[in-house]
Interface confidence: medium
């Protein structure tokens, strides 16, 4: 009798009430593997969740988070709120970045501004809570009497090493 059940394909279940006939999964349920004795209830994407993929007889629904939230956990089991640029999400909610740090995204944590002097450069544009500093030419390049025969190197993007 066990062999009869193993013949039931995904999308069906082995119905003990009907002499182990393979019955289709009822509406709003699925079986992703063969030989199942029951079908699993489809996940419902509601509230803060929205449907990314509808449930089928062989696969569960997949959820995303609505605008203003992003997924956390396995298979988007939770939705975490977005913050504004210039903020980071702590366990107690969105908090502004501390002075000297920035976040240019709606998620993630605040990161320290680039230290231009480590590369021998000067600060061309000051950093803000939302943006990193922009590094410019070295202070020596800007001093009076410095040769202007060669233009200063272009400012590199933060986080990229010089070639």
């Amino acid at each position: 009798l066990q062999d009869l059940c193993s013949n039931c394909p995904a999308g069906t279940f082995c119905d003990n009430n009907r002499s182990q006939i393979c019955s289709p999964c009822p509406p709003n349920s699925f079986s992703s593997a063969g030989g199942q004795r029951t079908c699993d209830i489809c996940r419902q994407c509601k509230g803060v969740f929205k449907t990314r993929k509808e449930c089928s007889s062989t696969s569960n629904a997949e959820c995303d988070c609505i605008s203003g939230y992003h997924c956390l956990g396995a298979e988007c089991s939770m939705c975490e709120q977005d913050c504004k640029q210039g903020q980071e999400l702590t366990k107690k909610g969105c908090k502004d970045c501390c002075f000297g740090t920035f976040n240019d995204q709606k998620r993630g944590i605040c990161r320290p501004w680039t230290n231009c002097s480590l590369d021998g450069k000067s600060v061309l544009v000051n950093g803000t809570k939302e943006r990193d500093v922009v590094c410019g030419p070295s202070p020596a390049d800007l001093s009076p009497g410095a040769s202007s025969a060669t233009p200063p190197a272009p400012a590199r993007e933060p986080g990229h090493s010089p070639q």
């Epitope: 975490e80 702590t90 366990k91 944590i109």
Partner: nanobody, 124 residues
């Protein structure tokens, strides 16, 4: 494989009590802080409580302070959340989570493992 399995959720009347458990496996339980987080229907994640690896330090969200108690039994690899004086607004899916250090962090980004969640419904 690191796993967290919550249990103890259910339907409870306002003013009632429930105790949630989270059975941990696959890691040295006492070496890591543990956290309870919840998600109410139609809302985002809300941090509930965190306990250090040793169990000496506990932290609570203002919304549950004085009503909920977090604890852990490191000999049984189990985390608990005792919930008293339950209110309708406590209705949520409760997730237990492992932090990546022994001390509590301010961030969700220090959480590296999540449980699947257990549903608590507070209704008369």
């Amino acid at each position: 494989e690191v796993q967290l399995l919550e249990s103890g959720g259910g339907l409870i009347q306002p003013g009632g009590s429930l105790r949630l458990s989270c059975a941990a496996s696959g890691f040295t339980f006492s070496s890591f802080a543990m956290t309870w987080v919840r998600q109410a229907p139609g809302k985002g994640l809300e941090w509930v409580s965190t306990i250090s690896g040793s169990g000496d330090n506990t932290y609570y969200a203002d919304s549950v302070k004085g009503r909920f108690t977090i604890s852990r039994d490191n000999s049984k690899n189990t985390l608990y959340l005792q919930m008293n004086s339950l209110r309708a607004e406590d209705t949520a899916v409760y997730f237990c989570a492992k932090e990546d250090t022994a001390v509590a962090s301010d961030y969700y980004y220090n959480i590296d493992v999540w449980g699947q969640g257990t549903t608590v419904t507070v209704s008369s």
